[in-house]
Interface confidence: low
């Protein structure tokens, strides 16, 4: 039974050019994570494997940063960038936890911190 | 049907080269890694390597690095083993199989192709 | 590396009878996987994480352990189950054990 929860930054909004970081934090579970996958829609951004450490995606490598722990830092954004973010989450025994991150960037210097949620 | 179908095998001499292919089908190629490995005659089975195919990481097993190089092509959800110099010792059928998302098993097995090294 | 050793290398058993393969890590893993090889076909995959069935396997099969001792159990052989199994693990690459070859006694 998956009794886990996956906390995450929940919406968010960045300025042009800034950086953001992304995070997902798996609680209320005692499941090994073997591995975490950073996705954007159907793109993979990063892997991070419990064996093999972090894998950044060639076509991203100049513009993401692994980490802090298994968070995924965004540089140099543009209002490309804006979109849904999804942290997934295969775990031992429980199986596939997945969260979502909403990023907007914004052209002015007025960007605010959406307020964090939960996901089931 | 989830399948992988290989081809490629076939007898080389000691020194040449020789590529693998395992063409797959029956699911999303780009969101799971595939591996390659090979079984000399009448012994047990060893890990060459594997690639996950929508960014093409690749991790190897660190004794073949420098002769044997995985690749993969999206466009025709097709994965690659590029064999160079190779021994007598290469001898073997070689398997490609998909790993199961999170849990690095091989759920998915290739019908194997056996590559005969051999002057 | 871990080295993954499988017991005994070949089991002689009788049709109907109980068998057990043992596999052992040279130090704690969480699980590992076991397949069955029939000559001259592809592994299969039989148990994964330690103790979950892959799809279409029998119930007479189970997988059970922890730590460094992990067993794959045969509750009574049937004709089609004499065959060679490989217990497998990932640490920074995967690892099989030497195999275990089921005959009939």
């Known amino acids: 039974m998956m009794t886990g929860t996956i906390e995450t930054t929940g919406n968010i909004s960045a300025e042009k050019g800034g950086s953001i970081i992304l995070q997902c934090h798996l609680s209320s579970t005692t499941a090994q994570v073997t591995q975490v996958n950073w996705e954007q829609q159907d793109q993979l951004l990063a892997i991070c494997n419990a064996d093999l450490g972090w894998h950044i995606s060639p076509s991203f490598k100049d513009r993401v940063a692994p980490g802090p722990g298994l968070g995924l830092t965004l540089q140099s954004l543009t209002v490309n960038d804006t979109g849904e973010y999804f942290c997934i989450y295969h775990t031992y025994p429980d199986g596939t936890y997945t969260g979502r991150i909403f990023l907007e960037v914004l052209e002015s210097s007025v960007a605010e911190h959406g307020a964090r949620f939960q996901i089931p | 049907e989830v399948q992988l179908v290989q081809s490629g095998g076939g007898l080389v001499k000691p020194g040449g080269s020789l590529r693998l292919s395992c063409a797959a089908s029956?699911?999303?190629?780009?969101?799971?890694?595939i591996g390659w490995v090979r079984q000399t005659p009448g012994k047990g089975l060893e890990w060459v390597g594997d690639i996950y195919p929508g960014s093409s990481f690749t991790n190897s097993n660190e004794k073949f690095k420098g002769r044997f190089t995985i690749s993969a092509d999206k466009s025709k959800n097709t994965a690659y083993l590029q064999m160079n110099s190779l021994r007598a010792e290469d001898t073997a059928v070689y398997y490609c199989a998909r790993l199961g998302r999170g849990y690095w098993y091989f759920d998915v097995w290739g019908q194997g192709t056996l590559v005969t090294v051999s002057s | 590396d871990i080295v993954l050793t499988q017991s005994p290398a070949t089991l002689s058993a009788s049709l109907g009878e109980r068998a057990t393969l043992s596999c052992s890590a040279s130090?704690?893993?969480?699980?590992i996987h076991w397949y069955q090889q029939k000559p001259g076909q592809a592994p299969k995959l039989l148990i994964y994480?330690?103790?979950n069935l892959a799809s279409g396997v029998p119930s007479r099969f189970s997988g059970s352990g922890s730590g460094t001792d992990f067993t794959l159990t045969i509750s009574s052989l049937e004709a089609e189950d004499f065959a060679t199994y490989y217990c497998?693990?990932?640490?920074?690459?995967?690892?099989f054990g030497g195999g275990t070859k089921l005959e009939i006694k």
């Open positions: 497998q693990l990932f640490r920074s690459g995967s690892a």
């Open positions: 994480t330690t103790s």
């Open positions: 029956g699911y999303t190629f780009t969101n799971y890694w």
């Open positions: 130090s704690s893993v969480s699980y």
